[in-house]
């Protein structure tokens, strides 16, 4: 195991190498399980001196009885059966959850001793033969420098205040009830929530993702997998909260809509532009209608001005439009918009954000939503406190500047956005909050019980599943003499049978060759990888277990290194690819150079525009020279001048 | 919306010169970034120069520097590439960029392109 940093925000790390076969062959059964036992599906390995057990199940409780993926202008029937939550076997309180895929968990382990993060290795690692696949390392070793940003991943005060003063231009639509429904709705659901003593505690979320989000995370499963782990991270917050009596708030994806690849060039698609200031983004968002949903939000991977990872409108309990529930209406530029919306970005000054700050961001922004403003005053920003014993507990989740995400305090809400919290939900909770329940046949997803899923009858367009609306014993059940139905996989046909063994199912890769359906399951099974040390990512990388993962300098028994200006090295080198003897740091020279021209011929490359440069100071541009981040010229940030270009007129550089 | 209209492509003999110039719609001109970029046949899309908001910095790539000049003239909402010593290897489609942002210009994402005027070079 390697004991050294992962990234510039994480300090140290393991790496897992369990059978991946194995999992994904348990991962296949626990899908089919009829058992009681096969439901469950065990993962055992050991990292951080401790042993962990894992014992998982499918997770059905995120994803609503409605929940439908859309992409590309189509609806699907999706599967969801990556998703797990479990705990580590024997240890009381313990909790995980994430996804399976490929034989891969990727997700966290909360324990007594702290909660850990589990991703996949070639997401950091691109400068190792790897022995290992995945990387595994606890909340203590995440060091994240900006945290929130300079004004708390959250957009300075101004910002809000022009935000402010908009929500209170929103013109109430008055909409009549005919009285007849009032008689014939009202009684009757008071009667239900005594009866049962149901509670409406739900908030549903519509879930978006832009094409850069989907271009950094790869498939849909994987972008499923990500919305998943971040809902499951603000319900455990939301749901261990006492809003002043009110309990058990928690979150479900109603509709999830995937932006692909193949949206950027889609006119009717608001976010395919490339460079959308944050607020414009959420002002995307906001102008669509988002009547049908608590939330809304859009997620991102893109690398807003001044450290902003996020940005939400803030909810009041009356006087003022926006955050939950909130319909869509009139405002004074005289455009109809929803203002129960928000967005967050994966992205921060060129790196990717760890999971758990961009979890934190998101019950960050969602708090926003829910009434709370940042935090201030002594009593709820005690990171500020002069008493170190305040201090050590670090600030709540609403503080607006700095906050590691380490400390006792980061991951709960202050006194002052309880209070603030309480009264917003206590008003309009009940506008569009639902009584919680478990996801049934209908939302496209095969869950537990279910043979299939191909929706509701005016969705279902499978010869091989019985829809929804069927009678209880024959919906979600594959129709008689059917093998298949397209809504378990990819690998199934319209005519219900299991595709023939050399039909593709998924494309090729840099570094992996095409899926192919093995005809007898419905599931694309793993794509076999490219040899190793191929080259992959414009020849800057090489591909190591199907991933492109390592440097081109392991090509030649090299290790990539950083040509740091404290060596001397010309500017122009910042941003060559650089190789180095193994463990040599003082034979770190460009690919180029007369060192390795027998390996590189004197051809020199050059690392992507874009990617950070003299030990993380700055980044490459298209001219191939390393621009500091925080230096003047083009990349001054421009203080409180997000997308109000008059403020621009004025500045110099 | 930003527009950006190019001009003053056209063919010239080996060593000559072209002006081109790249107009911009918008009165929030001086707020952008702005560069040149140019399409060879068969060819992808590479830098040619870039200047920032306050004309204070320029950028060339190293097969234009000392023959390419780029400026920009912010009452006129203009920049513009002074090409000079042309060779045939600078034939092309020339593009102009601009972005509100410049670090998306300087990585190679700018929001705003021009549709590109034509300049061959013949030997």
């Known amino acids: 195991q390697y004991g050294n940093p992962l990234n510039k925000y994480i300090r140290h790390y393991e790496g897992l190498s369990y059978n991946v076969d194995s999992l994904h062959q348990k991962h296949q059964r626990a899908k089919r399980a009829v058992s009681h036992e096969d439901q469950f599906l065990r993962l055992d390995f050991h990292a951080h001196g401790r042993h962990f057990n894992l014992r998982m199940k499918r997770d059905t409780s995120l994803f609503s009885d409605e929940f439908k993926v859309e992409t590309s202008n189509k609806v699907l029937d999706y599967d969801t059966s990556h998703i797990y939550t479990g705990h580590i076997y024997g240890e009381e309180g313990s909790f995980s959850h994430g996804s399976v895929i490929d034989g891969r968990f990727e997700g966290f382990i909360q324990t007594r001793g702290g909660t850990f993060y589990v991703e996949p290795a070639e997401r950091y690692i691109k400068d190792r033969t790897l022995p290992f696949h995945s990387v595994i390392y606890h909340e203590d070793d995440i060091n994240y420098p900006h945290k929130y940003g300079p004004q708390g991943g959250c957009a300075d005060h101004s910002v809000f205040e022009r935000m402010r003063k908009y929500q209170m231009t929103g013109v109430e639509e008055v909409t009549q009830i005919p009285q007849e429904e009032h008689a014939a709705n009202g009684p009757e659901l008071l009667r239900k929530k005594r009866t049962t003593s149901a509670e409406k505690n739900t908030c549903q979320l519509y879930i978006q993702t832009d094409h850069l989000f989907f271009k950094y995370y790869g498939t849909r499963e994987a972008v499923i997998a990500q919305i998943s782990s971040h809902v499951k991270a603000i319900d455990t917050i939301y749901q261990t909260t006492d809003f002043s009596g009110i309990r058990n708030i928690s979150f479900m994806v109603k509709r999830i809509r995937i932006n692909t690849t193949a949206d950027e060039k889609d006119p009717t698609n608001p976010f395919r532009f490339p460079n959308i200031g944050v607020e414009k983004f959420l002002e995307l968002n906001s102008e669509q209608n988002h009547d049908d949903y608590c939330l809304a939000y859009v997620f991102t991977d893109r690398d807003f001005d001044d450290g902003v990872l996020g940005l939400a409108w803030v909810g009041a309990p009356s006087g003022s439009s926006g955050g939950i529930c909130e319909k869509s209406k009139l405002y004074s530029d005289g455009k109809k918009k929803s203002l129960n919306t928000g967005i967050i970005t994966v992205q921060n000054y060129g790196s990717h954000v760890p999971p758990k700050v961009s979890h934190i961001t998101f019950a960050h922004e969602v708090g926003h939503n829910f009434g709370s403003p940042h935090d201030s005053g002594t009593e709820c920003t005690p990171g500020e406190s002069k008493n170190l014993g305040q201090k050590e507990n670090g600030n709540y989740i609403m503080y607006a500047r700095a906050t590691s995400g380490d400390k006792l305090n980061n991951n709960k809400f202050s006194l002052c956005s309880i209070r603030n919290i309480s009264q917003v939900l206590e008003k309009k909770r009940n506008n569009c909050f639902v009584e919680s329940g478990q996801p049934i046949c209908g939302n496209g997803m095969v869950e537990q019980g279910e043979e299939c899923d191909c929706g509701y009858s005016d969705q279902c367009k499978d010869e091989c599943c019985f829809d929804a609306n069927q009678p209880e014993g024959r919906k979600c059940k594959l129709k008689p003499g059917k093998q298949c139905s397209p809504s378990q996989g990819p690998c199934c046909t319209a005519q219900c049978a299991f595709k023939s063994k050399s039909e593709k199912c998924r494309d090729d890769s840099d570094c992996a060759r095409e899926g192919i359906c093995n005809g007898f399951t419905a599931l694309c099974p793993a794509s076999d990888p490219k040899p190793n040390f191929t080259d992959c990512n414009r020849h800057t990388q090489v591909c190591i277990n199907g991933q492109c993962a390592g440097s081109i300098c392991e090509k030649y028994g090299l290790e990539e290194c950083t040509c740091a200006s404290s060596d001397g090295k010309d500017d122009k080198e910042l941003c060559h690819v650089c190789c180095m003897k193994k463990m040599d740091p003082s034979t770190c020279a460009s690919t180029g150079s007369v060192q390795w021209s027998r390996h590189f011929s004197g051809r020199t490359i050059t690392l992507q525009p874009g990617s950070p440069c003299n030990d993380f100071r700055g980044y490459c541009d298209v001219f191939m020279r390393c621009r500091l981040v925080d230096a003047d010229g083009p990349l001054a940030r421009l203080k409180k001048a997000i997308f109000s270009p008059e403020l621009y007129e004025n500045i110099a550089e | 919306e930003m527009q950006l209209v190019e001009s003053g492509g056209g063919l010239v003999q080996t060593g000559g010169s072209l002006r081109l110039s790249c107009a911009a719609s918008?009165?929030?001109?001086?707020?952008?970034?702005v560069g040149w970029w140019r399409q060879a046949p068969g060819k992808e899309r590479d830098v040619v120069a870039a200047?920032?908001?306050?004309?204070?910095?320029?950028d060339y790539v190293d097969s234009v520097k000392g023959r390419f000049t780029i400026s920009r003239d912010n009452a006129e909402n203009t920049v513009y590439l002074q090409m000079n010593s042309l060779k045939p290897e600078d034939t092309a489609v020339y593009y102009c960029?601009?972005?509100?942002?410049?670090?998306?210009?300087?990585?190679?994402?700018?929001?705003?392109w021009g549709q590109g005027t034509q300049v061959t070079v013949s030997s």
């Open positions: 960029a601009a972005d509100i942002n410049c670090r998306n210009l300087y990585t190679g994402r700018p929001e705003y």
């Open positions: 918008g009165r929030t001109f001086t707020s952008y970034c």
């Open positions: 200047i920032t908001r306050g004309s204070n910095s320029t």
